[in-house]
């Protein structure tokens, strides 16, 4: 929520006995972090630990295979987005421990926050493409065996970034830093001031975009799929529709604090006590929004290790064959063991 | 009564320096920030910054943080005001003013309850 | 910095008049407490600024309940129900939710 969203103590319990001293603080509470906050600090701290270290070896193991496979082009790419928006985290968490402070300036605070933003686009987009690539080669493997190829795989990453950038600017734009006078503190957020057209319009599409129509479409993309995948009877249908929902869940079920609270904030009055206390919820909505960006690599060892029984090999080669695994399209009728699987694993970034 | 006891005129010439004085009563010194605030002829108010006397922190706005210094004496309860490389632009009333711990449900030391009666500052070669 | 623009910059009235004096901020001074610290001082010929109304619609001790304020964000309104001959003067809203601290360009209140 793009809002500024962080709250001080109150101070108006103060008389004439009070000594005002800038170096100590004056309300009792001040040092306390609010439990939201505290959560989201833990959050963070995992996320960052599993995200940049997960993350880091999907790209390591997918970045070889990329020239070759397709679906490690899928894979790298969701990795980087996500591995991008973990490296913000130690900035964001610094800023929360301080009470929402940002010593860190203007240009950061354009940049870093909006980080998770970009990633939620680009991660949705690119599982869109994943999608669509699912969907052909169920229903179009003709096509596939003619078209498909690396080349199209990365010009469709690079479309879908370029969309995510270009769905990130509005929020990037709108971010300033403000210096407020008492307490004295240095905040990072939007400010749309005059303009609570555009502020509701911003979360309206981000809301659409980037959470109701990728809904809609790939609840329907994978029905289809699914469908298909059972009426061949394909190998681990079960255990795919398992996978499938929990790669489609996570991202809904994630972002879905954030966007529900970041609508009801720019429509909601900015001194209504509602948006008070959802703007102190807003560094916990972020920070569960954030859990996206260390999902995939469990994911896929979790479904690495349900597709070979128990963890026998290293975790790069076990995230090798559930990465790498190149979807092979034959002309029969029948659907590859490869496609249900890769298919299965988690696509999705955000 | 609360006061803020202002020297009325000060003259200085161009490129010199001038220290003005804001002496207070009626109130503990050390609790109150103050703040500086100049007014031009005919224009309006234009905040200069605050200074907590108990510390000596001060916070300035930035148009004026390479000319003003702002000072306190807790013995004599007095604040000081010293502007430096003078300009015609600096002919103005220079106000100090004290800002409340708490009123009537306020929160902080947003608004200044009391005010001097200000100095004119005059330029002239 | 935040920009105070009030209107009008001359309000002429008769006495009794009801009169209304508008100030517009360039940024939300919502602080992130969720109060906006925005005040209205009168500045009388030859005067100091004295305080009225201090955060948006809080009075002043002393000062009469014919002066009210009200807004919230960047709009804000300062209105005196049937104004006296001790009222006039020069009005100035005041910011201090962010630094610096900002005034708005004053509103000369007059007889016609």
């Known amino acids: 929520m793009d809002s500024f969203n962080y709250t001080t103590p109150d101070y108006g319990h103060y008389d004439d006995k009070d000594t005002l001293d800038l170096n100590t603080p004056v309300d009792k509470t001040s040092n306390t972090l609010r439990v939201p906050d505290i959560l989201a600090l833990v959050i963070f701290a995992v996320v960052f630990l599993v995200g940049v270290l997960g993350n880091a070896l999907v790209v390591w193991v997918t970045a070889f295979e990329a020239k070759r496979t397709i679906n490690a082009i899928w894979f790298l790419n969701l990795a980087v987005a996500d591995f991008l928006s973990c490296l913000a985290l130690p900035i964001l968490f610094t800023s929360i421990v301080q009470h929402h402070h940002w010593p860190f300036g203007g240009a950061a605070c354009s940049i870093l926050p909006s980080l998770i933003l970009l990633n939620m686009y680009a991660s949705i987009l690119l599982l869109a493409t994943i999608s669509a690539d699912r969907f052909l080669l169920v229903f179009k493997p003709i096509w596939c065996q003619n078209f498909r190829g690396a080349g199209l795989a990365w010009i469709a990453c690079a479309v879908a970034w370029g969309l995510a950038l270009l769905l990130t600017i509005p929020s990037f734009l709108y971010r300033v830093v403000r210096e407020e006078y008492f307490p004295p503190k240095v905040l990072c957020g939007v400010d749309y001031s005059h303009d609570k057209r555009r502020e509701r319009a911003v979360a309206i599409v981000r809301l659409v975009l980037g959470f109701l129509w990728p809904l809609l479409t790939l609840t329907i993309c994978y029905t289809f799929i699914l469908l298909r995948t059972w009426s061949r009877r394909a190998t681990r249908s079960t255990k795919t529709l398992k996978v499938v929902v929990a790669v489609v869940a996570s991202f809904f079920i994630f972002w879905l604090p954030y966007q529900v609270t970041g609508i009801m904030m720019s429509f909601l009055e900015p001194s209504s006590p509602t948006f008070l206390l959802l703007k102190k919820l807003d560094s916990l909505c972020v920070s569960f929004a954030y859990i996206n960006c260390c999902i995939n690599p469990i994911i896929y060892v979790v479904a690495g290790q349900g597709f070979q029984g128990r963890l026998r090999k290293s975790l790069p080669s076990l995230l090798r064959n559930v990465l790498t695994e190149e979807s092979v399209v034959r002309e029969s009728k029948s659907f590859t063991r490869s496609t249900v699987d890769t298919m299965a694993q988690k696509t999705q970034a955000v | 009564q609360v006061q803020l006891q202002q020297s009325r005129a000060a003259l200085a010439k161009p490129g010199a320096s001038v220290k003005l004085s804001c002496k207070a009563s009626?109130?503990?010194?050390?609790?109150?920030?103050l703040h500086w605030v100049k007014q031009r002829p005919g224009q309006g108010l234009e905040w200069i910054g605050y200074i907590n006397p108990i510390n000596g922190f001060s916070k300035y706005n930035q148009n004026f943080k390479n000319r003003a210094t702002l000072t306190t004496d807790s013995s004599s309860s007095t604040a000081f005001i010293h502007l430096s490389g003078l300009t015609y632009e600096d002919f103005a009333v220079y106000y100090c003013a004290r800002v409340p711990l708490s009123y009537g449900g306020s929160y902080g030391p947003y608004f200044f309850d009391f005010w001097g009666q200000g100095t004119i500052l005059t330029v002239s070669s | 910095d935040v920009v105070m623009t009030q209107t009008p910059l001359s309000l002429p009235v008769s006495l009794g008049d009801h009169a209304s004096i508008s100030c517009r901020s360039s940024q939300s001074l919502i602080h992130s407490n969720g109060n906006n610290y925005l005040h209205w001082y009168l500045q009388k010929p030859g005067q100091s600024p004295k305080l009225l109304i201090y955060t948006v619609s809080n009075r002043f001790s002393g000062v009469p309940d014919r002066f009210s304020g009200s807004g919230s964000g960047t709009d804000f309104t300062l209105k005196i129900s049937r104004v006296e001959a001790e009222d006039l003067g020069v009005y100035f809203c005041?910011?201090?939710?962010?630094?610096?601290?900002?005034f708005g360009s004053g509103t000369k209140l007059e007889v016609k």
């Open positions: 009626g109130y503990t010194f050390t609790n109150h920030w």
């Open positions: 005041s910011q201090s939710t962010l630094v610096p601290l900002t």
